[in-house]
């Protein structure tokens, strides 16, 4: 058993049918010695008396808010949560496996630049009685500071019969140098509590590996005289690290017909302009990627040919 | 149609072209190592990230873009002195900091070159003959060093009398390649920045 926060405790259980569970001793936070009784949740049934209460915690019916009283007055509370270990592996019931970029990916994180700011998000089908708390650091043995905000519900979508809820959090490394070469990964830890179930999820990454630039901005077409060709131009996104000559991007320019089946023409360039043939009803899209370290491509910025 | 990227004109700043070749070569070598050594811990998640140049050179700090010198998190107190007569500096007025930067890059390359050559000698003794260092990568390191053209004491190749542990050598190779790729990215950024200045 360990303390998650004041008066909230997590009991770790080896989870299998007929398991013996864990013996837990609760102590009433009071100078009083006699006349103390204990109850669980809303029940008025007295579970025991005395300053300490010994219980055998086996399943969720044994978890909850234990309260000690004296003469009708509440003295203190202890909330017991359960953390299930199933055959040596902690349960992952609360969050959905996003399966991207690989199986067992519960947390996904992205950064728009090298400033040390990043966003993580996760999915669940649970809509109520759910709380999250996020901590982060650079490295784990001698951790350096990363400050995270509160996790918020960022999207809701319907998936088949189920509703899916997306939560996200923003974090910022306290003293980040955009040009630094990372040798210690960022660690992100999410505590999830659903009713009386506790779970924790972690992700470890280098900022360089989660970079996904914003799409190029100010995408414009300039027709070339007496030609079907157009000059496409764009700019670096505002959110990208500066100076751009140091933090350079490379670009992919795509000409896509109306039909998805039509052949796509693609050109790769380090410049912020390109000359392409603009077909009728086609659209031109441009996306960006770090020129020197191949992390994710940005989403496409698009403009119609006409 | 996948059209290749047009190579920028290297004339203005000869090291830019070499540094791009370096990044391409080390990235290819790392990819090859990860495929060949699939049963070894060779991914970014599995290896310890060590920097053999730590406390010996200070490339990131010495080559910091002017715009980032205001960022306190980027300023490290490490002081390292370097020789300052490189040919990449030819025909431009160069600040002491730029010379320091390029000589720091040269020292990095020299240290990695020695490590890689020592390691290759060991890998050539492996009866499995599983992996060797790409000669192209070693040649590209050499070319960039020549383009930088700093006068520097030659570092003798390390020789080892004891029987090599090939498993450890291959893991060390992965660690070295990951670190060198990160440094090659920095070098490429620096060359691009200097070229634009």
């Amino acid at each position: 058993i360990w303390e998650l926060k004041k008066d909230v405790y997590v009991v770790e259980l080896d989870w299998y049918p007929d398991a013996p569970g864990e013996m837990v001793v609760l102590t009433c936070d009071t100078p009083e010695e006699d006349g103390i009784t204990w109850t669980l949740d809303q029940s008025s049934e007295v579970l025991g008396s005395g300053k300490t209460l010994t219980i055998q915690v086996k399943e969720f019916g044994d978890a909850g808010q234990y309260t000690c009283h004296k003469g009708g007055e509440v003295l203190s509370h202890s909330l017991l949560l359960l953390h299930k270990k199933e055959d040596g592996i902690w349960s992952t019931d609360i969050l959905k496996d996003q399966k991207e970029p690989k199986n067992k990916t519960f947390l996904r994180c992205e950064a728009k630049n090298y400033s040390g700011r990043f966003t993580c998000w996760w999915l669940t089908t649970i809509s109520t009685d759910l709380t999250f708390s996020v901590k982060s650091s650079r490295g784990s043995s001698d951790p350096q500071g990363v400050t995270c905000g509160a996790a918020t519900l960022s999207a809701e979508r319907v998936r088949g019969d189920n509703k899916e809820y997306e939560y996200s959090v923003e974090c910022q490394e306290d003293s980040a140098c955009p040009a630094a070469e990372e040798s210690l990964p960022i660690e992100v830890m999410v505590d999830a509590v659903h009713k009386l179930k506790y779970e924790n999820y972690t992700s470890s990454f280098f900022i360089r590996d989660i970079i996904k630039p914003d799409p190029p901005k100010n995408l414009q077409l300039k027709p070339l005289k007496n030609s079907r060709q157009v000059e496409v131009s764009w700019e670096y996104p505002d959110t990208w690290s500066t100076p751009h000559s140091y933090f350079s991007l490379t670009f992919c320019v795509q000409v896509q017909g109306k039909s998805k089946r039509e052949k796509k023409d693609r050109v790769f360039t380090d410049k912020t302009s390109a000359t392409v043939i603009c077909r009728k009803n086609a659209s031109i899209s441009v996306r960006a990627q770090d020129r020197y370290y191949s992390s994710s491509w940005s989403e496409w910025a698009s403009v119609p040919c006409s | 149609r996948n059209l290749p990227v047009a190579t920028p004109d290297p004339g203005m700043f000869p090291c830019l072209h070499h540094s791009q070749n370096l990044l391409r070569a080390v990235s290819n070598m790392l990819q090859k190592a990860r495929q060949t050594l699939e049963f070894y811990p060779c991914t970014s998640e599995e290896i310890d990230h060590e920097d053999i140049t730590k406390d010996k050179t200070s490339t990131v700090e010495a080559c910091l873009p002017l715009e980032l010198t205001k960022n306190e998190s980027c300023l490290n107190s490490r002081e390292t002195s370097f020789i300052t007569n490189g040919s990449c500096l030819a025909s431009r007025k160069t600040s002491f900091m730029m010379a320091l930067c390029l000589s720091s890059i040269y020292e990095d390359l020299k240290m990695y070159q020695v490590e890689f050559k020592t390691m290759n000698a060991k890998l050539l003794m492996d009866p499995k003959r599983q992996i060797f260092l790409d000669q192209n990568m070693l040649a590209v390191i050499d070319e960039l060093m020549q383009a930088l053209n700093f006068n520097s004491e030659t570092v003798p190749q390390k020789s080892s009398l004891e029987e090599p542990d090939f498993y450890k050598t291959k893991i060390k190779l992965c660690i070295l390649l990951h670190a060198f790729r990160i440094r090659a990215v920095t070098i490429d950024r620096v060359m691009s920045y200097l070229n634009a200045s």
Epitope: P17, D18, E59, E86, I89 | -
Partner: antibody, heavy 115, light 112 residues
Framework: QVQLVQSGGGVVQPGRSLRLSCAAS????????MHWVRQAPGKGLEWVAF????????YYADSVKGRFTISRDNSKNTLYLQMKSLRAEDTAVYYC????????WGQGTMVTVSS | SYVLTQPPSVSGTPGQRVTISCSGG????????VKWYQQLPGTAPKLLIY???QRPSGVPDRFSGSKSGTSASLAITGVQAEDEADYYC????????????FGTGTKVTVLG
């Protein structure tokens, strides 16, 4: 004590269907994940499928994906394996088992796919 | 396809020490725990070892398990005639959990 009693095995022709059942008692069935494991005659153990305690997630071996469906009825304390498009290579003894560090196995039920 | 490899058979005379190996990889045995089962002919498998080296109550102490890196082993010290059976190791793969990964199985023969 924990008990898992299996039923539903038998002889079936290729291409036909069969449903296996596993009745649980002696524990809170709705709190635990469950597996199906099979063993072809003279061969080793092969995992077939898993279902979460609440039925929300199901996982299958590649060899049965799209043909077999694992399900559970927590109100009846019963686990099921619906097998469709059966093949000769599905011939095996099928076991249900609880998920956890200490597990309990059913007695096994023989499924023979033969024309 | 079995990714946990066991020797097809091992044998020993009564009282001898018999060991069975179970060889895996960095994504299965490496980060996960290992179980061992005993299966007598015509019966369901019986759990002998869980959590690499833990014995459930009722399992004789002549059975012991261990794990090192990406391999595990089961030892029977002082093998007895009733130990003649098939033995299977079981673990998980990091990417496919909760799918069970079973070893190829080892037939233990007690001679004499």
């Amino acid at each position: 004590q924990v008990q898992l009693v299996q039923s539903g095995g038998g002889v079936v022709q290729p291409g036909r269907s069969l449903r296996l059942s596993c009745a649980a008692s002696g524990f809170t069935f709705s709190s635990y994940g469950m597996h199906w494991v099979r063993q072809a005659p003279g061969k080793g153990l092969e995992w077939v499928a898993f279902i979460r305690y609440d039925g929300s997630n199901k996982y299958y071996a590649d060899s049965v994906k799209g043909r077999f469906t694992i399900s559970r009825d927590n109100s009846k304390n019963t686990l099921y394996l619906q097998m469709k498009s059966l093949r000769a290579e599905d011939t095996a003894v099928y076991y249900c088992k609880t998920h956890g560090s200490h597990d309990n196995w059913g007695q096994g039920t023989m499924v023979t796919v033969s024309s | 396809s079995y990714v946990l490899t066991q020797p097809p058979s091992v044998s020993g005379t009564p009282g001898q020490r018999v060991t069975i190996s179970c060889s895996g990889g960095r994504s299965n045995i490496g980060p996960n725990t290992v179980k061992w089962y005993q299966q007598l002919p015509g019966t369901a498998p019986k759990l002998l070892i869980y959590g690499n080296d833990q014995r459930p109550s009722g399992v004789p102490d002549r059975f012991s398990g261990s794990k090192s890196g990406t391999s595990a082993s089961l030892a029977i010290t002082g093998v007895q005639a009733e130990d003649e059976a098939d033995y299977y190791c079981q673990s998980y793969d990091r990417g496919t959990h909760p799918a069970l990964l079973f070893g190829t199985g080892t037939k233990v023969t007690v001679l004499g």
